[in-house]
């Protein structure tokens, strides 16, 4: 089953996906697609990396982290209701049928209030307010508001830098992470 992420219309959506390269600079191709992961590749590709760099990109879809260190999380800018749906993060590990596939469900909610026309730091709702985690027995729900007072843009960094913490494990379990090698 897909893990659910939420964002409001007009905000940025953040979909986490991680892997650990076997060696520095030893990257694995990754693709992001709209729709559940098919048997091969990604359907409706919105972004793709190869062994070195981003090699395909479409408007509003950006790599949000340091993808050369394995953070291939996706940011979708200025979302609309049409952006709702399943997204596939596919870690394309060499070999037959070795790929790791992660389906992430994005739910877009109508904006509660018409946002003021500020251009500054619209990341406040980039990470879902409510996230259902897995990997700790029964599904849990955590409200990010109960976390320490941190900038939500820091979440994926925390997941990288504080791997042993419960927050980091929850984030990685609720998104997608795989160790290569």
């Amino acid at each position: 089953s897909e893990v659910e992420y939420r964002a409001e219309v007009g905000q940025n959506a953040y979909l986490p996906c991680f892997y650990t390269p076997a060696a520095p600079g030893n990257l694995v191709p990754v693709c992001w697609g709209k729709g559940a992961c098919p048997v091969f590749e990604c359907g409706n590709v919105v972004l793709r990396t190869d062994e070195r760099d981003v090699n395909y990109w479409t408007s509003r879809y950006w790599l949000n982290g340091d993808f050369r260190k394995g953070d291939v999380s996706l940011t979708i800018e200025n979302v609309t209701l049409a952006d709702s749906g399943i997204y596939c993060c596919r870690i394309q590990i060499p070999g037959i049928m070795n790929d790791e596939k992660f389906n992430l469900k994005l739910v877009i909610k109508p904006a509660k209030v018409t946002p003021a026309p500020t251009r500054q730091r619209d990341f406040t709702a980039a990470f879902p307010r409510m996230l259902t985690t897995r990997g700790h027995g029964p599904a849990e729900t955590q409200t990010l508001g109960s976390l320490p007072d941190i900038n939500l843009t820091q979440i994926s960094t925390l997941a990288n830098e504080l791997r042993d913490s419960r927050l980091a494990n929850d984030l990685r379990d609720s998104g997608a992470t795989i160790r290569i090698g």
């Epitope: 600079g25 760099d53 950006w62 790599l63 982290g65 050369r68 800018e77 900038n151 843009t153 994926s156």
Partner: antibody, heavy 122, light 108 residues
Framework: EVQLLESGGGLVQPGGSLRLSCAAS????????MSWVRQAPGKCLEWVSA????????YYADSVKGRFTISRDNSKNTLYLQMNSLRAEDTAVYYC???????????????WGQGTLVTVSS | SYVLTQPPSVSVAPGKTARITCGGD??????VHWYQQKPGQAPVLVIY???DRPSGIPERFSGSNSGNTATLTISRVEAGDEADYYC???????????FGCGTKLTVL
């Protein structure tokens, strides 16, 4: 060929304002995050501000937050830096720089303009 | 906040190997980028993502990054390599780009 051409620098009194422009050519402007980086005479490079490709998100160094505003006009392939409440310590060469492809923040600065000098003095 | 530490100066004889370091807490977990700046000129990217070289940059320039130190290595140094070299990272905790304060490479 990628080209970045800054303009708008000059001499301004403390407390004054200035607007820098950076005209970009040779690439799809809206596909790249852009930044302003400055360098005071004889000093280190200091990142000032960044803006995502669409202009939807902006980021500022603590030293300029609340005084400087970065913006972009993708239809004109131009990056701007509005500088208000200028101080003597803002005196520097200001460079515009292009980030890397497909990344929200830009990650690194692949191309740089030649810079424009801003002098804040009475 | 995150800090990058570079030695103020490095001296090397022509034809020898120069190593310029950039220190930071667990910097190996971040991608490091290096710039060369000659007097009166804009910086030029010489290494990105720890060890990648942009087109037009000689193979003599290489980079590595692990633990708490990133290193820019210039082999067979030439007089034209004399410049200031800056390391840079993106600090995702603050959403700030950070530069080291530069290392002046002097070719003896």
């Amino acid at each position: 060929e990628v080209q970045l051409l800054e303009s708008g620098g000059g001499l301004v009194q403390p407390g004054g304002s200035l607007r820098l422009s950076c005209a970009a050519s040779g690439f799809t402007f809206s596909s790249y995050a852009m930044s302003w980086v400055r360098q005071a005479p004889g000093k280190c490079l200091e990142w000032v501000s960044a803006i995502s490709g669409s202009g939807g998100s902006t980021y500022y160094a603590d030293s300029v937050k609340g005084r400087f505003t970065i913006s972009r006009d993708n239809s004109k392939n131009t990056l701007y830096l509005q500088m208000n409440s200028l101080r003597a310590e803002d005196t520097a060469v200001y460079y515009c720089a292009r980030g890397s492809y497909g990344t929200y923040y830009g990650n690194y600065f692949e191309y740089w303009g030649q810079g424009t000098l801003v002098t804040v003095s009475s | 906040s995150y800090v990058l530490t570079q030695p103020p100066s490095v001296s090397v004889a022509p034809g020898k190997t120069a190593r310029i370091t950039c220190g930071g807490d667990n910097i190996g977990g971040k991608s490091v980028h290096w710039y060369q700046q000659k007097p009166g000129q804009a910086p030029v990217l010489v290494i990105y993502y720890d060890s990648d070289r942009p087109s037009g940059i000689p193979e003599r320039f290489s980079g590595s990054n692990s633990g708490n130190t990133a290193t820019l290595t210039i082999s067979r140094v030439e007089a034209g390599d004399e410049a200031d070299y800056y390391c840079q990272v993106l600090d995702r905790r603050s959403d700030h780009f950070l530069f080291g304060c530069g290392t002046k490479l002097t070719v003896l």
